[in-house]
Structure formats: structure tokens, C-alpha cells
Amino acid sequence: MAVTACQGLGFVVSLIGIAGIIAATCMDQWSTQDLYNNPVTAVFNYQGLWRSCVRESSGFTECRGYFTLLGLPAMLQAVRALMIVGIVLGAIGLLVSIFALKCIRIGSMEDSAKANMTLTSGIMFIVSGLCAIAGVSVFANMLVTNFWMSTANMYTGMGGMVQTVQTRYTFGAALFVGWVAGGLTLIGGVMMCIACRGLAPEETNYKAVSYHASGHSVAYKPGGFKASTGFGSNTKNKKIYDGGARTEDEVQSYPSKHDYV
């Protein structure tokens, strides 16, 4: 029950996280800036991974895609790549985890297969979350290190005087959405990995039960299993899950080196 709950919660948390990563990637508010109160109109500029928008005091907003811009910074391309990789891995992870959910029965899929799928999706969620956190952090680092801040200098050219406007960009809402979403995806992935441990068939050492017979005769365990002496009992019984509980006697024992042929 705890395993099912952990797996289900991990799935839901990861789903919310990946939705957040997608939202952050699409958002325009990665960085925001009040340019200054221009004598004509107050201008508010905000920029995302894909386009830059300008909102005027009148409420008019215009956005331009970066596809018209030559020489995009390599860092921006890296952030884009990280976010897209995060989304793709997360989406695949979600798809895998749906089939891995213990509460969903698909044919005669064994728990060992579900455990493997749960682990796979968990790892995918972890990597997806890390990609998102890395992408957002790289962008934030660009802002912190004044990558986006123009120095106030003037120079004259053929077209007259060019003055760069002192602009300091601040963290936009998308950065916080990205960090939280990446964190949720990461937590969801960890929960899936934890759930995988509970699903996986594992070797359990049961206390040996010896059936002692008089003399050197052998004792037979019920159920037509191999006979064994009271001295070399097979203590390593493998658990086999098929969705229902089994008693110890119902568990198939494997031959040990002490078993008689």
C-alpha cells in the first residue's frame, strides 16, 4: 500500500513539475526591465527564450521573435537546449511511469517489469528536473554577472551618436517557475526510485524449518518439493509475486548443494 502511494505521489508530483517546466520554457518573463521613463512613453521590456516583448504605458504590447535576430548568444542556445531536453525526458518518463503504476493492470505484466519501468521513469524525472534547474540557473547567472547590463558608454559613428542605455535586468517569473518545477520533477523522480525498491522482487532469508525424521530417512516437504535432510535446509527462498499473498511453504525453493538427487 505504501509502495503504491509513494509511486502514485511521485507520478503526480513529477506531472506537476513537468507541466511547470513546459510553462517556464514558453513564458516570456525570463528577464524583466523598466527601460526608463522615455519622454514619449514609459517602456517595460521583458524577454524570454524565444522572443522579446515591449509593453508601453498605454497598454500596447508588441513581441518580436528572436528568429529575426542574428548571432544569438551561445548561453541562450544552451538554456533552450537544456529546457527542451528536460521536457522530452520528462514526457517520456511520464509515458513510461503510467504503464509502471502498480494500480494499473496491463495484461500479465510482472512486478519485476513494473519495478524496472518505475526505476527508469524515476531516473528520467531526476535528469529532467536537473536539466530544468541547470537551464534556469545558467540564465539567472547571466543576469547576476551583468551579462544583460549594458555599460553606459557613447561612441560616434557614421549615423551619429550612439548611447547605450543603462539597463539592469531582473529575474522574471519564469525563473522561479522553472526552479520550483525542476525541484518538483526531481522530488517526483526520487519518489519513483524509492517506490521501485518496494516493487522489486528481492531475496529474503527465512528461518529454516527442519523436518527431522528418525534415522537417516529423508523428510518431504508438502507440495511435491525436493526432499532435503534436516542438516542442509535451503534457507534462501525466492519471493515470487503474482499479486496475491503466499505462505512460506508455497514459495518455490531452489536446489542447494546439499540437496539429494
Epitope: N38, V43, V54, S57, G71, M149, S150, Q163, T164
Partner: nanobody, 119 residues
């Protein structure tokens, strides 16, 4: 690099008209505001008229009702139609553009100026 090319200046009699134009070219990503400023000898530079991408306009007090600013966004060009010119309108007229030249790069570009003489 962003270049501004101004044209249309010259000498005119009082009450006459002139049309100034300013074309922006170069590494322009997004022009936000285009406008005109003027500076008479021994005076501070002042706003004549400005126009944002959204169509917001602002005029200097001394030119309201006489000057009209217009803009062709497709050509990155701004025009200033000056009517009923007065001798006090004599000045060097500078084109001014606020440009988003790239990601996180904002430029305020000034033209070299065109002289308007009313006498």
C-alpha cells in the same frame, strides 16, 4: 551598429513648411520609440515630438498644433511634418531612436542632425 539617416532640413520663410525624415538601419531588432529633438544655439536640447511603436505620441509645448509626427514601422522611418514655421523654430533637429538591438541590449541612437533655418 545602428545608423540613422536624416533628411529634409533647409531654409524656409516664416509660415512655411518642411518635412523631415529619419531612416534607421543596421542591427535593429525592435525599435521602441522614434522621435525628434532640437537644439537652438546656446540652448538645451528639447523634445519636439516622439512616437512609440504602439502609436503613443508626445509633442513639445511650443510645437503643438503645428508639427505632426508619423512613423512607418515597416521601413523603420519617422517623419516630422512642420507647418506654420516661426523664426524661433530655427535649430538643429536630431532624430532619436530607442532600440532593442538584441537580447538584453538597448541603445539610444542619435542622428547627426539636420539644420532647419526659418528667416
Amino acid at each position: 551598429q545602428v545608423q540613422l539617416v536624416e533628411s529634409g532640413g533647409g531654409s524656409v520663410q516664416p509660415g512655411g513648411s518642411l518635412r523631415l525624415s529619419c531612416a534607421a538601419s543596421g542591427s535593429i531588432f525592435h525599435i521602441v520609440v522614434m522621435g525628434w529633438y532640437r537644439q537652438a544655439p546656446g540652448k538645451q536640447r528639447e523634445l519636439v515630438a516622439g512616437m512609440s511603436t504602439g502609436g503613443t505620441t508626445n509633442y513639445g509645448d511650443s510645437v503643438k498644433g503645428r508639427f505632426t509626427i508619423s512613423r512607418d514601422n515597416a521601413k523603420n522611418t519617422v517623419y516630422l511634418q512642420m507647418n506654420s514655421l516661426k523664426p524661433e523654430d530655427t535649430a538643429v533637429y536630431y532624430c532619436n531612436v530607442l532600440v532593442i538591438s538584441g537580447i538584453g541590449s538597448h541603445l539610444e541612437v542619435w542622428g547627426q542632425g539636420t539644420l532647419v533655418t526659418v528667416s
